[in-house]
């Protein structure tokens, strides 16, 4: 249950719960929108985004989008509601504490996207193959 003090302090429409009834709190995410990036051929990269923003809604998670085409590389960092698609893709890894990049099919470019639900988790984006695995034992190690 929500402590009475909190109920008195805030409006009820600010209280959002997950499927288990636990209260969800607004998250802090890196939020630089689209910026040029030097992140290429690395196992992981830092976002180099100096803006940490509080997400508008408690259900929003952190998202990072890495794109490479013939001209440049960009990294996008935002908050986004996982119930809604982003760049036409579902945020299937939104509950992950780490931002583990998954490649998506986009014509004319290389496109990776990740989402995660811990503070500033989109500051460190992970491309390493060891994370992109279907091995359940390894996933246990990663998410412990």
């Amino acid at each position: 249950t929500i402590p009475p003090h909190v109920q008195k302090s805030v409006n009820n429409d600010m209280i959002v719960t997950d499927n288990n009834g636990a209260v969800k709190f607004p998250q802090l995410c890196k939020f630089c929108d689209v910026r040029f990036s030097t992140c290429d051929n690395q196992k992981s990269c830092m976002s180099n985004c100096s803006i940490t923003s509080i997400c508008e809604k408690p259900q929003e998670v952190c998202v990072a989008v890495w794109r490479k085409n013939d001209e440049n590389i960009t990294l996008e960092t935002v908050c986004h509601d996982p119930k809604l698609p982003y760049h036409d893709f579902i945020l299937e890894d939104a509950a992950s504490p780490k931002c583990i990049m998954k490649e998506k099919k986009k014509p004319g470019e290389t496109f990776f996207m990740c989402s995660c639900s811990s503070d500033e988790c989109n500051d460190n984006i992970i491309f390493s193959e060891e994370y992109n695995t279907s091995n359940p034992d390894l996933l246990l190690v990663i998410f412990q």
Epitope: S9, F31, P58, S118, D119
Partner: antibody, heavy 121, light 107 residues
Amino acid sequence: QLQVQESGPGLVKPSETLSLTCTVSGGSISNSYFSWGWIRQPPGKGLEWIGSFYYGEKTYYNPSLKSRATISIDTSKSQFSLKLSSVTAADTAVYYCPRGPTVIRGVIDSWGQGTLVTVSS
Amino acid sequence: EIVLTQSPATLSLSPGERATLSCRASQSVRSYLAWYQQKPGQAPRLLIYDASNRATGIPARFSGSGSGTDFTLTISSLEPEDFAVYYCQQRSNWPPTFGQGTKVEIK
């Protein structure tokens, strides 16, 4: 009624480490409904956010102090502490350990009385 | 980090008068702005959060308005206990930052 009380030495020498403790009574810091942290106020000046956390999530530090500030939590004693290394006269301030509802994190609805720390040789 | 500029630095008014305090942000803070009152030798006290929501136990004479970069705290009729320093604070981008304060003094 949740209350906070700051404690620590009132005088610290330059280049040393400032250590303060905040004791929470009437509740638990492992209650994630509340955010906790440290804010300071130099004499006659404005307020500066040092860092904050809520239970189960990582501690957020002000980048301007990040390399020097460490907040640690002892849930068994219902305490959390601040260590600020390599202090100078500019770190002289009243230090508060405020609390706020996590649903509106960043808003402070309860403050301790604060403790004055003077950095001087 | 976001810089909050409060004006005026000092406001000299008499009890019963209306006080209007301004806070301007260096970039948009959406509606994530709070106001605090601080009296000498005391810790600050939360008055308003998220631009216009009064905190628990705060009298109706205190009201907040604004969004984006421009915010106002209004005290409709000053009581003797309202003479203090008032700080605005944003929580849109972290670290949260405070304005330099407006002192409301007795004229």
